[in-house]
């Protein structure tokens, strides 16, 4: 079956996360919960099944420094992932289109 338009993947996913989370930064995977030993990452959640803004926001880093696990910096990138200069991210119109698509 063809993937629904609500899926996000590749650079579009990274850009949309950057837009949604802003200065907070974000994680590509959340720590596994006590209930589930397996950590499901943003790619599994958004590339291969439908994804919404609420779900994306759960991958944002916690705003307050005191609440964040300081041992793991925000925007945790996988091995061999290109490090993007922050200045390259500002494509507001593109992100706006992606987030509007997710709101529908």
């Amino acid at each position: 079956a063809y993937r629904p338009s609500e899926t996000l993947c590749g650079g579009e996913l990274v850009d949309t996360l950057q837009f949604v989370c802003g200065d907070r930064g974000f994680y590509f995977s959340r720590p596994a919960s006590r209930v589930s030993r397996r950590s499901r990452g943003i790619v599994e959640e958004c590339c291969f099944r439908s994804c919404d803004l609420a779900l994306l926001e759960t991958y944002c880093a916690t705003p307050a420094k005191s609440e964040r696990d300081v041992s793991t910096p925000p925007t945790v990138l996988p091995d061999n992932f290109p490090r993007y200069p922050v200045g390259k991210f500002f494509q507001y119109d593109t992100w706006k289109q992606s987030t509007q698509r997710l709101r529908r």
């Epitope: 590749g10 650079g11 996913l13 790619v43 590339c47 992932f81």
Partner: antibody, heavy 120, light 107 residues
């Protein structure tokens, strides 16, 4: 040394099947998503499919959807491409490639390719 | 799908020449644009990723620039081993797509 080695190509009749393999070495295979990219003789590059690091997610080009299946065995460090209902237009050199494509990254390691010829 | 258009499709250059190849995306892709070199009978190899980042081990005579829809690969002083075909590729969204290629030949 980081290396990808494809095998399984050959001559097959239209409508036939073939299974390609890609053996990975020199890196932690289970941490990377993997892709297949093909190149018809004298033509450009065409992305075929990607599989997530765990093997739980896949995406295909429209041209192969429903006919090709990408899979992996992380315990064997091997990537596969099962090709069914082959057509003449599937004739190409098939490359496996490592990349961070699901995160917007590039193909940083390529295999040497395996040739698939579909002809009667 | 995002279409990638490369130009020129081929060009002739002499050793030492400055060569510029352009790539245009059918819609904005931020800087998610990669460049590959392919020599005859060989697999492609990555040169530049995210528009301007030089892959480790690639000579500094290669450079990339651009953002949005328009991108450029420049070889500041072409060397004999640079005569090959070059492809751009977007990694902004799936399906991933490549440009048609630019063949750089010896004049």
């Amino acid at each position: 040394e980081v290396q990808l080695l494809e095998s399984g190509g050959g001559l097959v009749q239209p409508g036939g099947s073939l299974r390609l393999s890609c053996a990975a070495s020199g890196f932690t295979f289970s941490k990377y998503e993997m892709d297949w990219v093909r190149q018809a003789p004298g033509k450009g590059l065409e992305w075929v499919s990607v599989i997530s690091s765990s093997g739980g997610g896949t995406i295909y080009a429209d041209s192969v959807k429903g006919r090709f299946t990408i899979s992996r065995d992380n315990s064997k460090n091997t990537l596969y491409l099962q090709m069914n209902s082959l057509r003449a237009e599937d004739t190409a050199m098939y490359y496996c490639a490592r990349g961070r494509t699901l995160y917007g990254g590039a193909f940083d390691i390529w295999g040497q390719g395996t040739m698939v010829t579909v002809s009667s | 799908d995002i279409q990638m258009t490369q130009s020129p499709s081929s060009l002739s250059a002499s050793v030492g020449d400055r060569v510029t190849i352009t790539c245009r995306a059918s819609q904005p892709i931020n800087t998610y644009l990669n460049w590959y070199q392919q020599r005859p009978g060989k697999a492609p190899r990555i040169l530049i990723y995210t528009s301007s980042t030089l892959q480790s081990g690639v000579p500094s005579r290669f450079s990339g620039s651009g953002s949005g829809t328009d991108f450029t690969l420049t070889i500041s002083s072409v060397q004999p081993e640079d005569f090959a075909t070059y492809y751009c590729q977007q990694s902004y969204s799936f399906p991933l797509t490549f440009g048609g290629g630019t063949k750089v030949e010896i004049k």
